[in-house]
Amino acid sequence: VPRWRQQWSGPGTTKRFPETVLARCVKYTEIHPEMRHVDCQSVWDAFKGAFISKHPCNITEEDYQPLMKLGTQTVPCNKILLWSRIKDLAHQFTQVQRDMFTLEDTLLGYLADDLTWCGEFNTSKINYQSCPDWRKDCSNNPVSVFWKTVSRRFAEAACDVVHVMLNGSRSKIFDKNSTFGSVEVHNLQPEKVQTLEAWVIHGGREDSRDLCQDPTIKELESIISKRNIQFSCKNIYRPDKFLQCVKNPEDSSCTSEI
């Protein structure tokens, strides 16, 4: 008799999930000498242990603590780039500006980037059919809790000037419900962080408008100021030129704001 399986609203675990995590771990530790000591099999075991045999709507941050411990990593706290709804450009930027780091440039972020996973209560099986959707099913699902945990830790580690890349093509440039708005903003440490500098990325279309005056940016400024952190904002009017100028800062066309 086939066992009844909970049908969730979200996509199932990414195919070849265990192999992908293990392969990514090996690759990361080879590229980053400071993480060479990491035992990738132990990392996978800790990752698996966080969600296997557990109800995928009852996952807690504590479930991920063994993985967090194994993935402990020191990044320069004054070189952190947060992002919201504009992951690709943020990653392109840190690929060029090698001394800056997004969460996905750390081991744990790199392992889980773009992956989905969940298990089932009381069975050691991984659910490849469906996983809980944050909105339609539950927020305490394995993927959401993972990102909440690593995002909180990443924000807590930040110091001096923290940068955040925001998508100017969205109706809410700053969204209180995003991971940045709901987790990272509230976990920046005022005793360590002097300034949050927002980079508002304009869409492909040419525009002269100052999106730093957007009401949602004013809302972000208010939240940050109340936490005794200074706030500044810059428009990135031409993202393509911005990246080009990061690559070639000596270029004569790179003197004006982009």
């Epitope: 093509s169 969205r170 109706s171 279309r205 040419e206 525009d207 002269s208 408008r209 100052d210 005056q213 957007d214 428009n235 009017y237 031409r238 066309s253 004006s256 704001e257 982009i258």
Partner: antibody, heavy 119, light 112 residues
Framework: QVQLQQSVSELRSPGSSVKLSCKDF?????????MSWVRQKPGHGFEWIGD????????FYGEKFEDKAKLDADTVSNTAYLELTSLSSEDSAIYYC???????????WGQGTLVAVSA | DIVMTQTPLSLPVGLGDQASISCRSS???????????LHWYLQKPGQSPKLLIY???NRFSGVPDRFSGSGSGTDFTLKISRVEAEDLGVYFC?????????FGGGTKLEIK
């Protein structure tokens, strides 16, 4: 060819409201182009009221018009709207909608709607 | 707000003559993205404005090459090399470098 078709003239009494419409016949471009509203008063030249980006509903207002005007857009009918409240004789003018041709450049203008406010 | 000042108020010209209209802004229109958002429009009696020149010197589609624009910073000029009867009307400059967009008071081009 007509690209922006505005509603007909309106006569209103002081204190009332009026809602003007501007239909864009280029349905491809309408959602992702800012639509501005500009008014022209005799002897006062042109005044920019504000603009809206229909697909995401982003709105900018001229400071002078923040409490006077309300912009709106419907991407199904490709129509932009300007609502003017608490009308006074000072609001008597021709109101134009104008869609940007390139970023931040008003390239295409409607024929204008005359609003007359009189007791 | 940026104030746009046009001179002259009225410009009588003969057909075939050259006409020159000046526009001055109260602050630089060079935007931090490298563009200068200064534009010229023509409004004929009973009609809505038509875009002639955008970003200082670019002719909008369908605009004859007798119209040209120049300038930088705060000083700009529209030139019509050989005035034709259809060019008569009121010319406006406008800036969209800084919100709110603002307009010049207009220059009326009329036949001498």
């Amino acid at each position: 060819q007509v690209q922006l078709q505005q509603s007909v003239s309106e006569l209103r009494s002081p204190g009332s409201s009026v809602k003007l419409s501007c239909k864009d016949f280029d349905s491809e471009v309408f959602p992702t182009s800012y639509m501005s509203w500009v008014r022209q008063k005799p002897g006062h030249g042109f005044e920019w009221i504000g603009d809206i980006l229909p697909n995401i509903g982003r709105i900018f207002y001229g400071e002078k018009f923040e409490d006077k005007a309300k912009l709106d857009a419907d991407t199904v009918s490709n129509t932009a709207y300007l609502e003017l409240t608490s009308l006074s004789s000072e609001d008597s003018a021709i109101y134009y909608c104008a869609r940007e041709a390139y970023g931040s450049i008003l390239g295409y203008w409607g024929q204008g709607t005359l609003v007359a406010v009189s007791a | 707000d940026i104030v746009m000042t046009q001179t002259p108020l009225s410009l009588p010209v003969g057909l075939g003559d050259q006409a020159s209209i000046s526009c001055r802004s109260s602050q630089s229109l060079l935007h931090s993205n490298g563009n200068t958002y200064l534009h010229w429009y023509l409004q004929k009696p009973g009609q809505s404005p038509k875009l002639l020149i955008y970003k200082v010197s670019n002719r909008f589609s369908g605009v004859p090459d007798r119209f040209s624009g120049s300038g930088s910073g705060t000083d700009f000029t529209l030139k019509i090399s050989r005035v034709e009867a259809e060019d008569l009307g009121v010319y406006f400059c406008s800036q969209s470098s800084h919100l709110p967009w603002t307009f010049g008071g207009g220059t009326k081009l009329e036949i001498k």
